[in-house]
């Protein structure tokens, strides 16, 4: 195991000004032991609402790299392979938890952060607003 | 703030048998301050690959509630509102980080865990395997 250095500038479990502090074992347990890592790797190309993946990188965050989906078209791909603007490609978003060092440069003190990521795109019927 | 009870059955930062233990502040910082909470709330109904949301609840996990998508159909909804089985509804999956109480029921001791969640569904062209 490791011993956590008592750096005076870094919080510890007795610090009443460091609210809701818990201890976390960073040995990640993987619950998805039988999943195929290539599971949905080509959906971004085969979808009627295809998307590109963009790298969002921040070395001070864990995970440092997050892949963000951006829909390729405003419309959706029809049976002829053309973009149909009567339908809309929209991103499916999810809030995920990430870790961030806080205060920065303290090796064993982190803060949970929620960020919104676009995971992929889906094709939806547009909401039509009728002018009265 | 809170004080962390010294429950003898729960590990603390000096416990050499609790590897890679760090302090994490659970006062979650939300980077998505300007996002609309209803952002994609009705996509599951309007999509050509609609899905149902199932509540996955586990009091020993943080977050304790995760909403899982299950595609409603094998095929996709066509312009006539019927299911077209020449296309496939497939789940878009993502691995996310969660915290799990470890040992169970210890209020301030967790382990990082990776789980695979289905966020929504998209409509894809099927892969056709030709028989030789």
């Amino acid at each position: 195991g490791i011993t956590i250095p008592r750096n005076p500038g870094c919080p510890n479990s007795e610090d009443k000004n460091f609210p809701r502090t818990v201890m976390v074992n960073l040995n990640i347990h993987n619950r998805n032991t039988n999943t195929n890592p290539k599971r949905s790797s080509d959906y971004y190309n085969r979808s009627t609402s295809p998307w590109n993946l963009h790298r969002n990188e921040d070395p001070e965050r864990y995970p440092s790299v997050i892949w963000e989906a951006q829909c390729r078209h405003l419309g959706c791909i029809n049976a002829d392979g053309n973009v149909d603007y009567h339908m809309n490609s929209v991103p499916i978003q999810q809030e995920i938890l990430v870790l961030r060092r806080e205060p920065p440069h303290c090796p064993n003190s982190f803060r949970l952060e929620k960020i919104l990521v676009s995971v992929g795109c889906t094709c939806v019927t547009p909401i039509v607003h009728h002018v009265q | 703030g809170i004080t962390i009870p010294r429950n003898p059955g729960c590990p603390n930062s000096e416990d050499k048998n609790f590897p890679r233990t760090v302090m994490v502040n659970l006062n979650i910082h939300n980077r998505n301050t300007n996002t609309n909470p209803k952002r994609s709330s009705d996509y599951y109904n309007r999509s050509t690959s609609p899905w149902n949301l199932h509540r996955n609840e586990d009091p020993e996990r943080y977050p304790s509630v995760i909403w899982e998508a299950q595609c409603r159909h094998l095929g996709c909804i066509n312009a006539d509102g019927n299911v077209d089985y020449h296309m496939n509804s497939v789940p878009i999956q993502q691995e996310i980080l969660v915290l799990r109480r470890e040992p169970p029921h210890c209020p301030n001791s967790f382990r990082l865990e990776k789980i695979l969640v289905s966020v929504g569904c998209t409509c894809v062209t099927p892969i056709v395997h030709h028989v030789q």
Epitope: L26, N52, S64, V65, W67 | L97
Partner: antibody
Amino acid sequence: QVQLQQSGPGLVKPSQTLSLTCAISGDSVSSSSAAWGWIRQSPSRGLEWLGRISYRSKWYNDYAVSVKSRITINPDTSKNQFSLQLNSVTPEDTAVYYCAREVDSIYYSYFDIWGQGTLVTVSS
Amino acid sequence: EIVLTQSPATLSLSPGERATLSCRASQNVWAFYLAWYQQKPGQAPRLLIYGASNRATGIPARFSGSGSGTDFTLTISSLEPEDFAVYYCQQYRSTLSLTFGQGTKVEIK
């Protein structure tokens, strides 16, 4: 099981281009869960990462600052291989060159499969 | 660029003894992106540990890793004859920052 097989000349003249190829079996160069990289090793520099390619709806190329102006890594999807080109070589580029698979889940990063290594000598 | 400094440069031990190898980073790195490799003469490096403490497939339990922040350790609990080799740590900070330590040679005393 995944294997990497390297090929290419062991002797290159100064100012010329070093070219090596790495053939992949048991995995795909366009896999979305891996990146494919080149690493070299010399007594003076130790192990030095040179660069990688990875495919995520398009090809991403990442190169070490030390060689950025001289390096190109290209995929060949038809042959399921990738190549290294290092231009304007000098005797300082003499090293054993390795290709490797970098496991590229966002949660971990490490090289789990390595090629056999190719000793490249830069000399006239 | 993050510099990884390994110590000692050489470790002279007998079979059955415990080996403790250190890897110190010039700035904080995520433990999840810290790996250890073993290299024998004329061979490519072989992955031992990833994520600072996870044993790679097929690696014996006598190898263990620990640490976080800037200080990481590889421990071989009881040296076997085949463990005498050079050991390297490696970090990934960003897509353009990936570095190796200079290595620790574990030799037979």
